[in-house]
């Protein structure tokens, strides 16, 4: 509450997160023209990335383009990209939607469709829908430990959200355990009024707000965090503004002296930890 | 403007960026002693990195040291590093400028020069100039979509820079489209009074400032962002303080049961998105 | 000092860091059942990661699990994980402490112990102590250059911590050179009253606070940074809350048509650069 006689100071904050959990992923894998059931286990090293600061990312879905190599190939026949003759293809043209540079030739993509030939990582990425349900939908049961150290330099006061009395096997609950700093990802979504299973398909951004309203006067000292959750990406966003949350990364390797890559389009939840508040003292 | 009767509150912000574009890179490639012209396509997975938070990086230039292996070799003969006898080389010495630990021997680097032998990733990185013009100079035409969600918790008010009415094929322009949040990288530099082609060689840091000056009173409500741009690194910086922006990373692999790496010195532009402002309410 | 007549404004800040140094690492390496002494050199590309923003990480220790592959194997026999019959193992069960999913069978881990068989990255990670002393303990002698650009938009004032008059071969010292922005990592720890050698084993988080108290009135202008250091992680933290600072990442490769990975548990120091302060003007 506002105590107007107090000298207020904004919080200086440092955050450290640790995600726990494993996911079982079952998907169809094609090798040598044969499609079979692939089953794999993903642990933290597979679905999260070494990140700094006030964010962490959990991959919940992905699309792989394996064995790409730099060469010439027909571009992907997305809406408006098909051609019937070379006139439709402009040598040196880079379509921002495409993944390569046109050679000026119109070539067969498959038995029924022709597209402009491009110099690119080939075969070009298929613009297919993210798998539904999400491959790592079980990430809903992962947990994250959040450690938050705060400082009010003007008041020379430091504290943290984890106290020595806390129990490391707790799980945050708004009513029963509001000071526990281990959060089940599914619970975060539930608190924010969002459906994890749905968001996991395309990805999204979730805010974890930590509010410190600190009264540092000795006679009525109080300084504990209050956690709240809200979705930060726009779920109603138009296609052209790239809904959800995804990014592409590549694993490079050499085969028969040719550099190849596997391109991974990773969908997932980016969690932003937003720490704010003030410390007041007479 | 300052309305002194209002209760002001700083903005809580979350940012999401998405870079688009492909670059055609032509460079001399030496294989088996033969130098030929190499041509390759770089897409987002090749020139940017999965990053969190209020920064994104676009690689505009690079120097590669291929096939390095842990062994003994002469260090690079940079200024002051040459030797004529073992006396000049001190066993166990690590020169901060060097990339290895001296063995105490002075050995031939090439036909004319001798340097101290080091235990290092060999052959050691040549300290050559960044290619000029920059290899990915066409990154000037890349675009970045910036999504910014802001919150004034005390006023319980949330908004974002992208409105449902916006057009996903727009490009920001200070006069014609100051609310569009898709920016051409070259335009950002032009607005900041900088030359992209020049900065792309050594790299640099560019600030994209998003200023929210929000009046949250219902009778005169206003809350839209204002974008401005300024260069954050010091272009006049002394050599000793490492001008530009670059970092080294490695790709590791095994060949004939020996661990090898390709070292990449990546030069590029780091874009820092600096969100600030206040929300005022009576 | 507080000048109540002044209009105060919080600082907008951008940070760029550059770490220098090489480490010599000696460790026991087992190949084909034979253990021998391994010796390697780590440079910046090996011990740090391309990071954005106000943090940088220096790896000081690690534990490797080489040649893991997705298959079935006995889980690691940590406290409470051993079994004597299949009844103790539940098909489909994922123990949050374990790294896999149980098949329901109890199988020999070694000659004396049995544990539940799991589908996982195998062999599962051994839960062994971090090496002591830390493998990259010599990181104490690494240096970091910190460049900080600050802006008070309301006062239209910009400056940076590095001035043209500064000497690029300086090292920060609280008394002798308090404006030098090149810091020896060991000195940072000493200033914070911490033991680098000790923290390097398990890792930790160190705060570098840069305080700008700027008087922007022309008649008594002053705007230079003041550096201070404090440890941000809790060194007395209970085991259950994951003391220190570490994360796992993996290097993937193919061998004999099977995807394999080397899992690295990296311990190290995350340095958080916390910039704060105000600019005041009449």
């Amino acid at each position: 509450s506002d105590k107007l006689y107090q000298r207020k100071e904004p919080v200086i904050s440092s955050v450290h997160t640790k995600v726990k959990g494993i996911a079982e992923v079952t998907e169809n894998v094609t090798e040598g023209g044969v499609t079979k059931l692939g089953h794999s286990i993903f642990d933290t090293a597979d679905y999260t990335f070494p990140l700094q600061g006030n964010s962490f990312f959990v991959m919940t879905n992905y699309v792989k383009s394996e064995g790409q190599v730099q060469t010439l190939c027909p571009e992907y026949p997305r809406r408006g990209a098909q051609c019937s003759s070379d006139r439709r293809c402009k040598k040196g043209w880079m379509d921002p939607q495409s993944k390569g540079i046109q050679t000026g030739r119109c070539v067969p993509y498959d038995k029924t469709r022709k597209t402009c030939e491009v110099s690119a990582w080939c075969p070009t990425e298929e613009e297919k829908e993210a798998p539904r349900p999400a491959l790592l939908r079980s990430a809903e049961n992962f947990t994250v430990l959040i450690k938050n150290n705060i400082h009010f330099p003007g008041h020379n006061y430091t504290t943290r959200n984890i106290l020595p009395t806390m129990n490391g096997s707790c799980t945050f609950h708004k009513t029963w355990d509001p000071q526990c700093s281990i959060f089940r990802l599914g619970d975060i979504f539930q608190e924010a009024g969002e459906n994890f299973t749905e968001v996991a398909v395309q990805g999204g951004i979730m805010g974890i707000e930590i509010y410190w309203d600190c009264n540092l006067d000795s006679w009525s000292h109080h300084c504990r965090p209050r956690y709240s959750f809200r979705r930060l990406d726009d779920k109603n966003m138009d296609e052209s503004f790239v809904p959800g949350y995804n990014f592409r990364y590549a694993k490079y390797y050499k085969e028969n002296n040719v550099e190849k890559r596997t391109l991974i389009k990773a969908f997932g939840i980016r969690f932003d930890i937003l720490v704010f508040g003030t410390g007041g003292k007479f | 403007s300052d309305k002194l009767y209002q209760r002001k509150e700083p903005v809580i912000s979350s940012v999401h960026t998405k870079v688009k574009g492909i670059a055609e890179v032509t460079e001399n490639v030496t294989e088996g002693g033969v130098t030929k012209l190499g041509h390759s396509i770089f897409d987002t997975a090749d020139y940017t990195f999965p990053l969190q938070g209020n920064s994104f990086f676009v690689m505009t230039n690079y120097v590669k040291s291929e096939g390095q292996v842990q062994t003994l070799c002469p260090e690079y003969p940079r200024r002051g590093a040459q030797c004529s006898s073992d006396r000049r080389c001190k066993k166990g010495w690590m020169d901060p400028q060097s990339k290895g630990i001296q063995t105490g021997r002075c050995v031939p680097y090439d036909k004319t020069r001798k340097t101290c032998e080091v235990s290092a990733w060999c052959p050691t990185e040549e300290e050559k100039e960044a290619p000029r013009p920059a290899l990915l100079r066409s990154a000037e035409n890349f675009t970045v979509l910036i999504k910014n969600n802001i919150h004034f918790p005390g006023h319980n008010y949330t908004t974002r820079n992208i409105l449902p009415t916006m057009n996903g094929s727009c490009t920001f322009h200070k006069t014609w489209d100051p609310q569009c949040s898709i920016f051409r990288l070259g335009d950002i530099f032009q607005e900041a009074g900088e030359n992209f082609t020049e900065v792309a060689v050594q790299g640099g840091i560019m600030g994209i400032e998003i200023y929210w000056d929000c009046n949250l009173d219902s009778w005169s409500h206003h809350c839209r962002p204002r974008y401005s741009f300024r260069r954050l690194d010091d272009k006049n910086m002394d050599e000793s303080f490492v001008p530009g922006y670059n970092f080294r990373y490695a790709k590791y692999y095994k060949e004939n049961n020996v661990e090898k790496r390709t070292l990449i010195k990546a030069f590029g532009i780091r874009f820092d998105i600096l969100v600030f402002g206040t929300g005022g309410k009576f | 000092s507080d000048k109540l007549y002044q209009r105060k404004e919080p600082v907008i800040s951008s940070v760029h860091t550059k770490v220098k140094g090489i480490a010599e690492v000696t460790e026991n390496v087992t190949e084909g059942g034979v253990t021998k002494l391994g010796h390697s050199i780590f440079d910046t590309a090996d011990y740090t990661f391309p990071l954005q923003g106000n943090s940088f990480f220096v790896m000081t220790n690690y534990v490797k699990s080489e040649g893991q592959v997705q298959t079935l194997c006995p889980e690691y026999p940590r406290r409470g994980a051993q079994c004597s019959s299949d009844r103790r193992c539940k098909k489909g069960w994922m123990d949050p402490q374990s790294k896999g999913i149980q098949t329901g069978r109890c199988v020999p881990y070694d000659k004396t112990r049995k544990t539940c068989e799991v589908s996982a990255w195998c062999p599962t990670e051994e839960e062994k102590e971090a090496p002591r002393p830390a493998l990259l303990r010599s990181a104490e002698n690494f240096t970091v250059l910190i460049k900080n650009n600050i802006h008070f938009p309301g006062h239209n004032y910009t400056t940076r911590n590095i001035l043209p008059t500064m000497n690029g071969s300086c090292t920060f010292h609280k008394t002798w050179d308090p404006q030098c922005s090149i810091f020896r990592l060991g000195d940072i720890f000493q200033e914070a009253g911490e033991n680098f050698t000790e923290v390097a084993v398990q890792g930790g988080i160190m705060g570098i606070e840069i305080y700008w108290d700027c008087n922007l009135d022309s008649w008594s202008h002053h705007c230079r940074p003041r550096y201070s250091f404090r440890r941000l992680d809790d060194k007395n933290m209970d085991e259950s809350f994951v003391p220190g600072y570490n994360f796992r990442y993996a290097k993937y490769y193919k061998e004999n048509n099977v995807e394999k990975r080397t899992l690295i548990k990296a311990f190290g120091i995350r340095f958080d650069i916390l910039v704060f302060g105000t600019g005041g003007k009449f």
């Epitope: 059931l37 089953h39 | - | 893991q68 079935l72 098909k91 589908s119 195998c122 062999p123 099977v258």
Partner: nanobody, 120 residues
Framework: EVQLVESGGGLVQAGGSLRLSCAAS????????MAWYRQAPGKQRELVAD???????NYADSVNGRFTISRDNVRNTVYLQMNGLKPEDTAVYYC??????????????WGQGTQVTVSS
């Protein structure tokens, strides 16, 4: 129906070499650990060598340095290269594989055995 089919056994002189192979056929999800066991007349079946899906190997002391186990994950086949054979290596050699028919449905499978006879 999953089957393990062995081949390569026979009669050989002491000091000679043989190469056993064993292929898994049928419909299954994944071949995990594979191994070779042997049983000499009047004795218990004993482990000769095993190999994980990640190519980690383990040998009985009596064959270490003489025998080499390897596998081909494309063909789901395990091999045993036996050099410097001794009369005491005479036995019926059995192939073993731990195979998942479906996800988390592992079973142990054995081959029918192949005779190796080392004459002095």
């Amino acid at each position: 129906e999953v089957q393990l089919v062995e081949s390569g056994g026979g009669l050989v002189q002491a000091g000679g070499s043989l190469r056993l192979s064993c292929a898994a056929s049928g419909s299954f999800f994944r071949v995990n650990n594979m191994a070779w066991y042997r049983q000499a007349p009047g004795k218990q079946r004993e482990l000769v060598a095993d190999i994980t899906r990640g190519d980690r190997t383990n040998y009985a002391d009596s064959v270490n340095g003489r025998f080499t186990i390897s596998r081909d994950n494309v063909r789901n086949t395990v091999y045993l290269q036996m050099n410097g054979l001794k009369p005491e290596d005479t036995a019926v050699y059995y192939c073993y594989a731990r195979i998942e028919l479906g996800v988390l449905e592992p079973r142990d499978y054995w081959g029918q055995g192949t005779q190796v006879t080392v004459s002095s």
